[in-house]
């Protein structure tokens, strides 16, 4: 109670402070900061119990996207979609919820993070956890054996998210997958090429793609003396090596998962190694590993993969890392994960720790799980962790204090005198019909200064100004907002001139 009283007092004081600053005509920035503080204090105060029980907020692990954030998001999506299309992918969509049965048994330990929906007329439903399992269901259901597709959509995980690190309960995934029987490692290499192209285009900093193979992992566990039943759980321990030390991983394997210390030590000798194709060669010579059929297949495929990656010019971005053991149960072959080496923080700043920004692998058995006859469709794919990328791009833009345009308006139709609303409406309509992105202020007689100010704030590059004299002369004054230079343009040439100045094609094809 005393706590609430203190907070109420602070809200009152802060309210007075804001009013005082406004009266003193303090700087806009200072007022903005103090208003933000007031809102934060009010948010902590919450609703007065007597007045209102309901707290207005988005559910845990979700967020709204502001126009600024949407502008960032659309730019990121544009880069990704252009790349997917460049590689010949078709696009599909699937329902946001699936039959619970569809998702069961596909995610191993992560199944507990699936959102189940309340009964809707007898069907047990769950929100999709990723886009891969619905894709496999789509292939099996439609009896497709061959497709290259991308899918960008929201997925849902009942996680405890660290939202500052770009982790949410509702988030976008951008998936690209190739399904079909092809010669080994060619589609896999293309997936890695796509991953590198996208991460390079986004300019979010230097990255490295770690590559491994599920068969090498399984073979390695077998020769080290891990029982089949413990493969998956030991995998999840090994996968933590990018975050914690070998000692901690070993303690977990021995202490919590009941592995013999000498078995753990044998695993440690392998999983702490990483390198390039030379490490593949080295392991092919390993007397124990090379005797394991699974591991030998995996190493052979990785050797081939590195040849193709060299031809694609991305071998310098790839590291063969034996500790990579991605958690999902459905991977059967090559697996990969892209991590940022350092985000482009300003000098003297710590790099942002956002972990993995893309991942994927081969899952040849997943479609077969849905086929009554168990017919397999080999698949390989990748997923771009866009939420983490949005976080990095947003923080980078914030650090650079870069202004982002949230609209694409090319021109504002303005008037220099009163009583010209009808003329403005006619002109803006002409521009819209010609495919020009145009706006006008919703006032009968707006001041010219206000109209110009609006353009500056919204980043609109051009103003088409109508005046009495211009109407008589059949011209429109076209003003550049940044250079303030004005030219008279004949009304019939206006559309062409705006398109020329904004670099838009002259016909809407």
């Amino acid at each position: 109670m005393a706590e609430r009283a203190a907070l109420e007092e602070l809200v009152k004081l802060q309210g007075e402070r804001v009013r005082g600053l406004k009266q003193q005509k303090a700087s806009a920035e200072l007022i903005e900061e103090e208003v933000a503080k007031l809102l934060k204090l009010k948010a902590q105060l919450g609703p007065d119990e007597s007045k209102q029980k309901f707290v207005l907020k988005t559910p845990k692990g979700t967020r709204d996207y502001s126009p600024r954030q949407m502008a960032v998001r659309e730019k990121v999506f544009d880069v990704i979609i252009r790349c997917f299309k460049r590689h010949g992918a078709e696009v599909i969509d699937t329902p946001v919820f699936e039959l619970k049965e569809t998702l069961m048994g596909k995610y191993g330990e992560d199944s507990k993070l699936i959102y189940d929906l309340k009964d809707q007329g007898g069907e047990l439903l769950s929100l999709r956890y990723d886009l891969t399992v619905p894709f496999a269901r789509y292939l099996a259901m439609n009896k497709l054996t061959n497709i290259k597709r991308y899918h960008i959509a929201k997925v849902y995980r009942r996680d405890n998210p660290a939202m500052t690190r770009g982790r949410y309960r509702e988030f976008y995934q951008c998936d690209f997958d190739i399904a079909g029987n092809f010669d080994p490692m060619i589609p896999d290499a293309e997936c890695l090429k796509i991953m590198c192209e996208i991460l390079s285009s986004l300019q979010i900093g230097d990255f490295l793609v770690k590559v491994n193979d599920r068969r090498i992992l399984d073979g390695m566990f077998a020769i080290c003396g891990v029982s089949d039943s413990k493969f998956r759980t030991i995998c999840s321990s090994v996968d933590k090596l990018d975050k914690v030390s070998w000692e901690e991983v070993k303690n977990e394997m021995v202490g919590e998962k009941g592995l013999a210390p000498e078995v753990a030590d044998r695993i440690g000798d392998y999983v702490q190694q990483h390198g390039g194709v030379s490490l593949v060669e080295q392991l092919l010579q390993d007397p124990k590993l090379s005797q394991n059929k699974q591991a030998l297949e995996g190493l052979g495929d990785l050797k081939l993969l590195f040849e193709y990656l060299t031809l694609f010019g991305i071998d310098d971005k790839i590291s063969f890392d034996l500790s990579l053991a991605r958690g999902l149960d459905y991977y059967t072959g090559v697996i990969y994960e892209a991590v940022l080496l350092q985000t482009p923080a300003q000098a003297g700043e710590e790099p942002l720790g956002v972990g993995s920004v893309a991942a994927g692998g081969r899952y040849d058995g997943l479609v077969g799980m849905f086929d009554p006859k168990g017919r397999k469709v080999p698949c390989v794919g990748l997923s771009i962790g866009v939420e983490r990328i949005f976080s990095i791009v947003e923080q980078r833009l914030e650090a650079l204090e870069e202004k982002i345009r949230t609209t694409e308006t090319q021109v504002l139709v303005a008037s220099a005198q009163k009583k010209l609303l009808e003329e403005r409406l006619k002109l803006v309509s002409e521009l819209w019909d010609a495919g020009i992105k145009a706006e006008l202020l919703y006032k009968k007689n707006p001041k010219l200064l206000n109209q110009l100010q609006y353009c500056e704030e919204a980043g609109i590059p051009l103003v088409a100004i109508i005046g009495e004299q211009e109407l008589k002369d059949g011209v429109i004054k076209l003003r550049s907002v940044t250079s303030r230079e004005e030219v008279d343009v004949r009304r019939e040439d206006l559309v062409e001139e705006i398109k020329r100045r904004t670099g838009q094609p002259l016909c809407i094809c």
Partner: antibody, heavy 120, light 107 residues
Amino acid sequence: QVQLVESGGGLVKPGGSLRLSCAASGFTFSDYYMTWIRQAPGKGLEWVSYISGSFAYTDYADSVKGRFTISRDNAKNSLYLQMNSLRDEDTAVYFCARYVYQVVAIGDYWGQGTLVTVSS
Amino acid sequence: DIQMTQSPSSVSASVGDRVTITCRASQGISSWLAWYQQKPGRAPKLLIFAASSLQSGVPSRFSGSGSGTHFTLTISSLQPEDFATYYCQQAKSFPYTFGQGTKLEIK
């Protein structure tokens, strides 16, 4: 429980640079304004700089403006103070502190402090 | 900048005594005032904020009052652990400034 631990202090020559860090735990770091406050040996307290939770706002005491830079990494729950062109009068124990109720410029939790000595 | 002046600069008292420390601001700061206690070699500890609100976990023998330019910190019955230096601080406008401190010593 809330904990703030400073590090990075030490002996530095006039004109030199130093970077202080403050590791925070036990609260949602990104919600809080954070501040650096210093205390010269045997003297009183001086508010050096602050930074808002979302990095949007910062300010500096006139005595350090242009030489010190405050920053934070919410992903790492860390606050930093980059100190350049250090002077003798910058010798002090530097404390990082958290604003009470996220935004009120009063330190409700403080670190143990890290000593910066500027001397030739 | 707002100047904060504390008085007295030091005070001697005995366990059980009532002690009052005063803080004046060079201009009106409404109730934007905090009081801290600092022991040698330690970080300051927040006692009072918003002039009179007791920070959680602080004993009720500490109390604050005042608004505008004149503020007081009162310790109703001194305990052995209360001997320390006390600072006031204004939180009205940046740069936020502290008083020069009042050292409370054992008589």
